[in-house]
């Protein structure tokens, strides 16, 4: 559209259109599918979900939670301040994401979608926070120095890492969804 | 809208803008129709992860792409064929929303629930 044109070429549906609530709530379905899909490389692969040395690698690792202050529990619940820890938690697991790209050998496509849809989320997360200020970004130096970290590690540690992002972000999704449905 | 006369090998840059709702939410496509022949799918972008189709004809020389932030589409066509004229429609379905969806799907008309006017384009010289 040149400069100052304000053209419209799809005009309004006839049937409601997709609100931004619903296109949101649909988003993270997306992602959290994707996250089955990789799941089921990963744990077909090795035995890493029925682990219970978690611990060992959940050392090194530093992935988003939800906790009671963040706001998205029923009981305290905050939009504003909920909102805020859904989008900065989202921004922080983009290197754990980046992390997961070179991971999967028959699922390289779906690890590339839900990356991507992720990126996606957060914009549009962004169009509904009021409070953008409030977002702090993570440090692109310090993202980088994490992520050669953990692939300096050894084998085992490198499939439990994948495993773990891989729970942590579907609980981390599942609780934003929960929280997401009640604004 | 970005529609014209255009020589060959030369380039042209189609918008698509909607009204009444938010075009970031859904799947776009790029159509196409030439007189006395059907409709046919050229491109694609999903809105759930970005990734992006072509038909074979267009392959190489066409490019959609989607900035979210002004809620537009776009399909860049470059090194145009006099066989490229034709009436160039976008549109909008939901064929996106689940988790391994078949991407070839999306150049099928019957894949899309809103549809533009059109904007003609002629390659000539």
């Known amino acids: 559209v040149p400069p100052g044109e304000d053209s419209k070429d799809v005009a309004a549906p006839h049937r409601q259109p997709l609100t931004s609530s619903e296109r949101i709530d649909k988003q993270i379905r997306y992602i959290l599918d994707g996250i089955s899909a990789l799941r089921k490389e990963t744990c077909n692969k090795s035995n890493m979900c029925e682990s219970s040395k978690e611990a060992l690698a959940e050392n090194n690792l530093n992935l988003p939670k939800m906790a009671e202050k963040d706001g998205c529990f029923q009981s305290g619940f905050n939009e504003e301040t909920c909102l805020v820890k859904i989008i900065t938690g989202l921004l922080e697991f983009e290197v754990y994401l980046e992390y997961l790209q070179n991971r999967f050998e028959s699922s390289e496509e779906q690890a590339r979608a839900v990356q991507m849809s992720t990126k996606v989320l957060i914009q549009f997360l962004q169009k509904k926070a009021k409070n953008l200020d409030a977002i702090t970004t993570p440090d692109p130096t310090t993202n980088a120095s994490l992520l050669t970290k953990l692939q300096a590690q050894n084998q085992w540690l490198q499939d439990m890492t994948t495993h773990l992002i891989l729970r942590s972000f579907k609980e981390f999704l599942q609780s934003s969804l929960r929280a997401l449905r009640q604004m | 809208s970005g529609g014209g006369l255009v020589q060959p090998g030369g380039s042209l840059r189609l918008s698509c803008a909607a009204s009444?709702?938010?075009?970031?939410?859904?799947?776009i496509g790029w159509f196409r129709q030439a007189p006395g022949k059907e409709r046919e799918g050229v491109a694609c972008?999903?809105?759930?992860?970005?990734?992006?189709y072509y038909a074979d004809s267009v392959k190489g020389r066409f490019t959609i792409s989607r900035d979210n932030a002004k809620d537009t589409v776009y399909l860049q066509m470059n090194s145009l064929k006099p066989e490229d004229t034709a009436v160039y429609y976008c549109?909008?379905?939901?064929?996106?929303?689940?988790?391994?969806?078949?991407?070839?799907?999306?150049?099928?008309?019957?894949?899309?629930?809103?549809w533009g006017q059109g904007t003609q384009v002629t390659v000539s010289s």
């Open positions: 009444g709702f938010t075009l970031a939410y859904y799947g």
């Open positions: 549109a909008a379905g939901t064929w996106d929303l689940k988790f391994g969806y078949s991407r070839s799907n999306c150049v099928r008309s019957y894949e899309y629930d809103y």
């Open positions: 972008i999903s809105s759930s992860d970005l990734s992006t």
